[in-house]
């Protein structure tokens, strides 16, 4: 077996794509290594090539099929085993039981765009992409503006615990630049986390009128 | 605290299946990361298997080559191994343990990791 400071870490997508994380430390910058999938229900099987993202880690993405299309069900159970070459020989290194729906990470909201602006505030609209149909409406949103002067970090977040593409952002200043990002998040799934932040969607309120208290 | 009691060991030729049982008794058994061990007669303790608190990932021994699964049901407070193509090296006490801390299934757990341990239950594959 792998010592105690390897890790081995994925998340679906709800569609058809399983992003995978192996760390270990001590491990070689250049060893081959590949996650490979195989689901107890399926025909198919699927590999992917773990690249190096640091000094001791590695990612890939099992591509299962189209974008869109549903791939794997809340009863499916995928095997998923990290393998790294030895030689000639592939060695196992570490071997998972992933049940798809309990790993849950959504890909990040897509399409922003700002419906309606006004001096104090902003009404903004988003899409989900590549998300499953089970989910229906049982999905939940955070969101955050950044303000001039500070940092991502320091925004609070805004919760909106239904399926609502939209936010009407209150009590902004006139003439005054903003960025806003959303991400996701199922309510279902042991592990399930948020999605990554959409890209930011950079606005900017309406000026106040000269002579008006607004 | 939870009490374990393992069951379904047994004598068995080469080849052939097994499917052990582990029953929890008084207390959260939801609660608790689970965990399958085995020792054979000389050996240290080696770990199998084990799976997280709502059952959303199982880590397994590389040495299992893909013949076991452990799988839990938290409505009826067990956690099974099912053993399949086993072979005479899989001869040993199977063990069932039971983890208080937090365990994400990421990693391979030491016995250390694990508070609280059944009996055990023999098993043994003939050739």
């Known amino acids: 077996a792998v010592n105690g400071t390897s890790q081995f870490t994925c998340f679906y997508n709800s569609r058809a794509n399983i992003s995978c994380v192996w760390s270990q430390d001590g491990a070689l910058q250049d060893t081959s290594c590949q996650v490979h999938a195989w689901p107890d229900r399926r025909r198919w099987n699927q590999t992917c090539e773990l690249l190096p993202v640091s000094q001791a880690s590695w990612a890939c993405n099992l591509i299962l099929g189209a974008p869109d299309s549903q791939k794997l069900t809340t009863v499916d159970i995928v095997t998923l085993r990290v393998l790294c070459r030895e030689g000639v020989r592939w060695r196992v290194m570490a071997i998972q039981d992933f049940k798809p729906f309990e790993n849950l990470r959504l890909m990040a909201p897509i399409s922003l765009q700002v419906v309606h602006v006004e001096t104090h505030r902003c009404n903004i609209s988003w899409e989900i992409s590549q998300a499953s149909h089970y989910f229906e409406r049982h999905l939940e949103f955070e969101a955050r503006t950044l303000s001039p002067g500070h940092t991502w970090e320091e925004a609070p977040l805004l919760t909106l615990k239904q399926k609502q593409e939209w936010i009407c952002l209150e009590t902004l200043t006139p003439d005054t630049q903003y960025e806003f990002q959303v991400r996701v998040k199922p309510l279902q799934g042991e592990f399930t986390t948020w999605s990554p932040w959409s890209q930011p969607l950079a606005f900017r309120t309406k000026p106040a009128a000269l002579g008006k208290d607004t | 605290e939870v009490q374990l009691v393992e069951s379904g060991g047994g004598l068995v030729q080469a080849g052939g299946s097994l499917r052990l049982s582990c029953a929890a008794s008084g207390g959260t058994f939801s609660s608790y990361a689970m965990g399958w061990f085995r020792q054979a007669p000389g050996k240290e303790r080696e770990f199998v298997a084990a799976?997280?608190?709502?059952?959303?990932?199982?880590m397994y021994a590389v040495s299992t080559e893909g013949r076991f699964t452990c799988s839990r049901d938290n409505a009826k407070n067990t956690v099974y191994l099912q053993m399949n193509s086993l072979k005479p090296k899989d001869t040993a006490i199977y063990y069932c343990?039971?983890?208080?801390?937090?365990?994400?299934?990421?990693?391979?757990?030491?016995?250390?990791?694990?508070?609280?341990w059944g009996q055990g239950t023999q098993v043994t594959v003939s050739s």
């Open positions: 343990a039971a983890m208080t801390s937090y365990y994400s299934g990421t990693y391979y757990p030491d016995s250390s990791d694990f508070d609280i």
């Open positions: 799976t997280t608190r709502g059952g959303g990932r199982t």
